[in-house]
């Protein structure tokens, strides 16, 4: 039994880091393998992660962490029974994938304006709370070409757009994702999408 692709890990910079790797053949990850992880700190102890299968030869493990600070460094040991298959380290602050925003809502009751709001996925005491920027994706269910991205570079989790920038009388969907420049993170996953029917009063034509 050998590791084909070494574990790579990403952290949500809050409580979970996810590590993925591939074995050289079909493996029952949860019964055959264990990933031991330990914070490099005098008084820390090793914790065991039981991996799950992620495709035939792929494994994934969700490492639980109390919290994360920039100096944190973890040692990782991948075991198959008594055999050490791989040894490495992981610094969560250097491999951050933010949590996805939630509670995306489209408010259509503001005159001729669409207000999209969503929730910051981090609590106020987390460092990323004040460092997230967002991308909002809006697309038409009827027209695949009607697909647009709005970059929200301010901290407020909201976006206002004129309803008239979208076609009237058809349904649209929106989703949002986040990233943080300060840690050069990857983009989060997209939030679940939300749907609304876009309708607005066309202005009277002047003759």
């Amino acid at each position: 039994m050998k590791v084909l692709q070494e574990p790579t890990c990403v952290s949500d910079y809050m409580s979970i880091s996810t590590c993925e790797w591939k074995m050289n053949g079909p493996t029952n990850c949860s019964t055959e393998l264990r990933l031991l992880y330990q914070l490099v700190f005098l008084l820390s102890e090793a914790h065991t992660c039981i991996p799950e299968n992620n495709g035939g030869a792929g494994c994934v493990c969700h490492l639980l962490m109390d919290d994360v600070v920039s100096a944190d460094n973890y040692t990782l040991d991948l075991w198959a029974g008594q055999q050490l298959l791989w040894k490495g380290s992981f610094k969560p602050s250097e491999h951050v994938k933010p949590r996805a925003p939630g509670n995306l809502t489209v408010h259509t009751n503001v005159s001729d304006t669409l207000l999209l709001t969503w929730s910051n996925p981090y609590p106020p005491d987390n460092y990323l709370y004040n460092h997230l920027t967002y991308a909002v994706n809006i697309w038409s269910e009827n027209d695949p070409a009607d697909f647009r991205i709005y970059n929200v570079t301010y901290l407020e989790p909201s976006l206002r757009i004129a309803a008239s920038t979208l076609k009237s009388g058809i349904s649209y969907r929106a989703r949002v994702r986040a990233w943080a420049q300060c840690y050069n993170t990857t983009w989060s996953e997209w939030s679940p999408s939300t749907k609304w029917h876009n309708s607005y009063r066309e202005p009277f034509e002047q003759h």
């Epitope: 700190f41 008084l43 820390s44 102890e45 109390d66």
Partner: antibody, heavy 116, light 109 residues
Amino acid sequence: EVQLLESGGGLVQPGGSLRLSCAASGFTFSRHAMAWVRQAPGKGLEWVSAITSSGRSIYYADSVKGRFTISRDNSKNTLYLQMNSLRAEDTAVYYCARVHRAFDYWGQGTLVTVSS
Amino acid sequence: SVLTQPPSASGTPGQRVTISCSGSAALDLSPSFNWYQQLPGTAPKLLIYADSHRPSGVPDRFSGSKSGTSASLAISGLRSEDEADYYCGTWDYSLSGYVLGGGTKLTVL
């Protein structure tokens, strides 16, 4: 709410023994390392000893090595410090502290006086 | 001592005050510093951990920074209730223990 309550302090003669206890509540005791820190009257803080969450690893300051023993009972949510061969310079308020990278929660302390 | 602090510091209300903590050559190359506040007659309280992180409930008037084996605690908008003893500390892996500075007594004039 995290609470740490020390007990067991008092007056003891040089060469004597004392056992301090620290009752913990408001958090999962078995998941946290713990420590003892002391403060002699009018002096600064001095780290005494620390123990990992399971009790597998233990550390002592040179000044108490061989005389003090730290231990814990995770089933009772209690931290202990057995102090033997006490000296006048061990006179101090002894604080119990939870460890999360630093000493993030402290008890109110218990006074140990070593005097004849 | 492995960590050296000035014995005293002072400032007037509203002022910004900085307390230094200098690590000796015996200290690890990249220590992580913590700061504690001890108000008169009370137990110490964690103010800053891992160089610059504030526990919840600590006002943002308190900030920490690090440069090599030295650290600083800054208090802006000084208040009378900030009058206390301040200690820096770090885990010393060569000693397998925790070291604390001698403490700095802050007086608000």
